[in-house]
Interface confidence: low
Amino acid sequence: SEVEYRAEVGQNAYLPCFYTPAAPGNLVPVCWGKGACPVFECGNVVLRTDERDVNYWTSRYWLNGDFRKGDVSLTIENVTLADSGIYCCRIQIPGIMNDEKFNLKLVIKPAKVTPAPTRQRDFTAAFPRMLTTRGHGPAETQTLGSLPDINLTQISTLANELRDSRLANDLRDSGATIRIG
């Protein structure tokens, strides 16, 4: 069953997805698609990474985390009701049928006419599972690759908190672990 996330029309939606590269810069291809994960690949691809960088993206869809460290969470900018639906995050681990597939359900709510100034956006559910590997995770990023790491437009406050605070690590650590190799 899908994990559910919510956002309001006009806001940014955040769909978390993580894995841990086996070594710094040793990236696993990832695709994001609109629709449930099919047997292979992603349907209706909106963003794709390869072994070195983001190599395909479409307007309004960005990676807001450090994808070189395995944070391949998707931000959808300025959502509309049409963005509602299932999204597939597929970690394309080498080998036959090794891919990890996460189906995330995005529910878009109409914007409130007069939102309370202190109200935070309503995101629900825990993070999806996190892939990890034996041994040590990647070292702190300095410059791991020959390309800029990230594209980001107006990321939501909550997404910033998730990425920047200890809460993010706590949530990641609480996820089910899958070991590769």
Epitope: D53, V54, N55, Y56, W57, N64, G65, D66, E140, T141, Q142, T143, S146, L147, P148, D149, I150, N151, L152, T153, Q154, I155, N160
Partner: antibody, heavy 116, light 108 residues
Framework: QIQLVQSGPELKKPGETVRISCKAS????????MQWVQKMPGRGLKWIGW????????KYAEDFKGRFALSLETSATTAYLQISNLKNEDTATYFC?????????WGQGTSVTVSS | ENVLTQSPAIMSASPGEKVTMTCRAS???????LHWYQQKSGASPKLWIY???NLPSGVPARFSGSGSGTFYSLTVSSVESEDAATYYC?????????FGGGTKLEIK
């Protein structure tokens, strides 16, 4: 909305130092590299280098190693380009640009004139 | 370094004409990392086409891009006066990131 606002024009003498600022707003500063590009009068665009806004680590094109230095003031969401020991041939307009998958947002440019 | 050579350096067209400018790389560029920028006189460059053929929002649909390997092109299907500008190709495939010398499009 995303904006990169650069400091104003500079008139300098050879041998002096100039520091150009680039104030970013409308996005989370440390999630996108900041690139710098030079445009000399009557010439094309030339990539100077970029700085990783999380680690502060810069990378320079070969032609700009030495006298050109990129730095950050992360708390102020501001990137800097400093050129020391200015030469007449540094006369140009310098642009900061958010270096993401492509250079999608640009500052308005800072004109630097070096003349004795 | 990967040298990008644009041609022609200057081109002139009448409104309604179709124009094509090219960008040739000295070594292979992944189509994902070949971009085009538009710069009008006295203004900052703007990302005009990304990843060979994708148009950012706000760029008119009369612009298109194509190519692969070492040869890329930008086409305007029906030139308008507002298209007068210099267009630069740029590659992100490896250091240093390089720009072509630019093609200046003049409108008659």
């Amino acid at each position: 909305q995303i904006q990169l606002v650069q400091s104003g024009p500079e008139l300098k003498k050879p041998g002096e130092t100039v520091r150009i600022s680039c104030k970013a707003s409308g996005y989370t500063f440390r999630t996108a590299e900041m690139q710098w590009v030079q445009k000399m009068p009557g010439r094309g665009l030339k990539w100077i280098g970029w700085i990783n806004t999380r680690s502060g680590v810069p990378k320079y094109a070969e032609d700009f190693k030495g006298r050109f230095a990129l730095s950050l003031e992360t708390s102020a969401t501001t990137a800097y380009l400093q050129i020391s020991n200015l030469k007449n041939e540094d006369t140009a307009t310098y642009f900061c640009t958010r270096g993401t998958y492509a250079m999608d947002y640009w500052g308005q440019g800072t004109s630097v004139t070096v003349s004795s | 370094e990967n040298v990008l050579t644009q041609s022609p350096a200057i081109m002139s067209a009448s409104p309604g004409e179709k124009v094509t400018m090219t960008c040739r790389a000295s070594s292979i560029v992944s189509s994902s990392y070949l971009h085009w920028y538009q710069q009008k006189s006295g203004a900052s460059p703007k990302l005009w086409i990304y990843s060979t053929s994708n148009l950012p929002s706000g760029v008119p649909a009369r612009f298109s891009g194509s190519g692969s390997g070492t040869f890329y092109s930008l086409t305007v299907s029906s030139v308008e006066s507002e298209d007068a500008a210099t267009y630069y190709c740029q590659q992100y495939s490896g250091y240093p990131y390089t720009f072509g010398g630019g093609t200046k499009l003049e409108i008659k």
